[in-house]
């Protein structure tokens, strides 16, 4: 009931709590002398369902049969309406519509750790929409039953607050949950278990790792566990990996030797525990231990390449290049590279440690037979040295690969193809494809890239350090013993017409012809490999079509003669450049008048 109900009563039959779909009878009756003054026959009783009128009646009482009430709480209020006055509230009642509890399902209990307490969970089934009390019972040995009630609205979990002990680990315990509300009760099926079934150990703690003699091959993982733990599983992975290595161990007593760790690698380790081979559940994984394994001496050998440059009649410049070892080969932080240069006939040798670079340049005599050895060193030792004899890589013309081509292959890739050399192709031990950005003037500081290809291959896809709209000088070397042959080509991964034309910087007269000189187009404006230059000229005040001369592009060329100009005629000259994608805009215009005599 609600309100004070001084003027009358509202009664509900059969009950204030009803099963969904049931009918209720609501009666509103006035107490004596509580009707409308003077006109008791004019009493008008009105029944509201929440704020909506559902029935009315003149007299001292009103009966209403109500059906179809929804799940939950519905408020009914009875009011009295008299002539010339506001409605007066008489009384009200709440009706609770719900269902009997369903049988709780999937009752399961767990005790977290040997010192933890037993907690059970279950599925309540559909909402009853009524106050429902859950009672959890646990019966076990020693003729004892524990019982706890849950009065939360949505109760599907209870912690008994008791601790099962391992004195008799095989003793049976039985748990049961009972749900009760005004419309009925229902009990779960009993869940029977032993101590070993429900105790879930705490995750291991205090995890440590030790490397004996700072060696990755002598690695022991240590941890602490609860006293009754029989089984452990270990999982570990390099920190940058998503895949775990898994190891199961029995009676480990808090230690295990790991034999397959890689050196100089950060690993993540986790451990889980279990009390029994086939009973109970695994603990949560422990907190992660992260540790880096010690270094080991490098394995593998450096990939070394070189470039020779003529200086003068007696000297040559040797530039050595090498690639970093992979992480798995370096097996530590590379502290320096050791380069040894040796003259093979005289036995003279010089050794140098290089730090922070993967290249080295020196000047040596053009005479003698020279060899180099390069190795990488970390704190534990050095890799095996890579030895190469310095030779003239392009000396053997018969070893030169044939029909070299370079074609764009998607974004920032170039496919280089060739045919084996004419000389016995089976003599080729390997091909080396080398590429570097094309810089007029042959700048030796430009980074060099290379890859090695097996002798049966006749193509290679180059993608490392390839940028769009840049022209690369590509060489293919065929190596055989102490001989080498090479062929070269220009190539780009992407091209468009150059952004500007060459700048004519001088026009000079020589024996009745002229020599035009120009500045190279800046590399960033070439937009790929240049194929041709065009020189245009026409008489200054003429409307005639210009004449043109097309000359193939060569890296070092920046002048060209023209001998078809008439003397004492003023000409306007300009230049353009072409890539495979098209022609540039005009470069600057220059005027020139040939002074020589007419023929």
């Amino acid at each position: 009931k609600i309100d004070a109900c001084k003027r009358g009563d509202v009664t509900v039959k059969p009950s204030h709590v009803i099963l969904l779909g049931s009918t209720v009878n609501i009666t509103c009756s006035l107490k004596p002398r509580q009707g409308c003054f003077h006109y008791s026959r004019r009493n008008k009783l009105i029944l509201y369902k929440f704020d909506r009128r559902i029935n009315f009646h003149h007299g001292h009482s009103l009966n209403s049969q109500v059906t179809g009430l929804p799940l939950g709480t519905t408020l009914f209020v009875c009011k009295l309406a008299c002539i010339n006055s506001d409605e007066i509230q008489i009384c009200g009642a709440e009706i609770f519509v719900g269902v009997a509890p369903e049988q709780p399902q999937n009752l399961s209990c767990i005790q977290k750790g040997e010192q933890g307490t037993v907690a059970c969970t279950w599925e309540r089934g559909r909402d009853t929409h009524l106050y429902t009390e859950y009672t959890l019972q646990l019966s076990g040995p020693k003729n004892l039953t524990w019982q706890k009630q849950c009065k939360d609205i949505y109760c599907d979990y209870l912690d008994f607050g008791i601790n099962l002990t391992p004195e008799s680990p095989e003793s049976n315990f039985t748990a049961k949950v009972t749900a009760v509300n005004s419309l009925g009760s229902s009990s779960s099926l009993p869940s029977t278990f032993t101590f070993l079934d429900i105790v879930r150990p705490l995750p291991p703690w205090d995890i440590r790792i030790k490397f004996q003699k700072a060696s990755v091959s002598r690695c022991t993982l240590y941890w602490r566990d609860e006293g009754l733990v029989l089984l452990n599983r270990l999982r570990y992975r390099p920190s940058n990996s998503r895949l775990w290595n898994m190891v199961n161990v029995t009676k480990a007593k808090g230690r295990h030797d790991l034999l397959d760790l890689k050196p100089f690698t950060e690993y993540e380790f986790q451990i889980s525990s279990k009390l029994h081979l086939y009973k109970g559940s695994w603990s949560d994984w422990s907190e992660s231990l992260r540790a880096q394994t010690p270094e080991e001496e490098p394995t593998g050998m450096l990939d070394v390449w070189y470039m020779k440059r003529h200086i003068d009649y007696s000297r040559q410049q040797i530039s050595l290049f090498w690639k970093n070892l992979s992480v798995s080969e370096a097996r530590g932080k590379i502290l320096h590279y050791q380069v040894t240069l040796q003259e093979l006939t005289g036995g003279k040798a010089m050794t140098q440690n290089i730090t922070g670079h993967t290249s080295w340049t020196t000047v040596i005599p053009r005479t003698g037979n020279w060899a180099v050895a390069v190795s990488a060193a970390n704190s534990k030792g050095s890799s095996l040295p890579t030895r190469i004899n310095i030779m003239n890589l392009c000396e053997a013309g018969l070893l030169a690969p044939r029909q070299v081509s370079a074609n764009s292959e998607g974004m920032d890739n170039i496919l280089v193809t060739w045919q084996p050399p004419r000389k016995d192709p089976s003599a080729v031990q390997e091909y080396v494809v080398e590429w570097r950005e094309l810089h007029p003037g042959g700048d030796t500081q430009v980074p060099l890239n290379w890859l090695r290809s097996r002798p049966y291959n006749v193509s290679a896809l180059i993608s490392e350090n390839i940028k769009s709209y840049i022209c690369y000088e590509i060489r293919v070397y065929a190596l055989s013993g102490d001989q080498g042959g090479c062929s070269s080509i220009l190539g780009n991964s992407k091209h468009k017409a150059p952004l500007s034309g060459p700048h004519i910087n001088a026009i000079t007269e020589e024996k009745g012809s002229i020599l035009i000189s120009w500045n190279s187009i800046p590399v960033q404006e070439q937009m790929g490999c240049l194929l041709h230059y065009r020189i245009y000229w026409k008489e200054r005040d003429s409307n005639s079509q210009p004449q043109l001369c097309e000359i193939p592009y060569r890296v070092s060329q920046n002048s060209h003669p023209i001998n078809s100009l008439q003397p004492r005629v003023t000409y306007v000259l300009w230049m353009t450049a072409l890539t495979a994608a098209g022609e540039s805009s005009h470069g600057n215009e220059r005027e020139f008048c040939l002074q020589g005599k007419a023929n």
């Epitope: 307490t117 076990g140 040995p141 020693k142 003729n143 004892l144 524990w146 019982q147 706890k148 912690d159 008994f160 607050g161 008791i162 601790n163 099962l164 002990t165 004195e167």
Partner: nanobody
Framework: QVQLQESGGGLVQAGGSLRLSCAAS????????MAWFRQAPGTEREFVAG?????????FYDNSVMGRFTISRDSAKNTMWLQINNLKPEDTAVYYC?????????????????????WGQGTQVTVSS
Amino acid sequence: QVQLQESGGGLVQAGGSLRLSCAASGRTFSNYAMAWFRQAPGTEREFVAGLSGSGGDTAFYDNSVMGRFTISRDSAKNTMWLQINNLKPEDTAVYYCAAATHVVVNYGLVRRRGTYDYWGQGTQVTVSS
């Protein structure tokens, strides 16, 4: 000084009901374990029912009384009750109230007399057939 005082015993016919009370004074036991034991003539004192004292109180019963006896307490009044329904002649005994100064969480310890630090004088319950 701590005192436990039982009351509510008496002579009842089989099938009848009784409500035993245990009033504690001298200290508050609302957060600690409390229990009822009984002792029939010529037998050892045996555990009947108890409250763990852990959060929300877990009740525990000897299986022989489960479903007929209900243990409860009012922490504010420092009082514990044992409601006994459907009494049987074998329920005839002196009923003792016991209190511990700690929470009992170990499953087996609740029925041991040594778990409890304070005891009442007892109240007689006699069931006639």
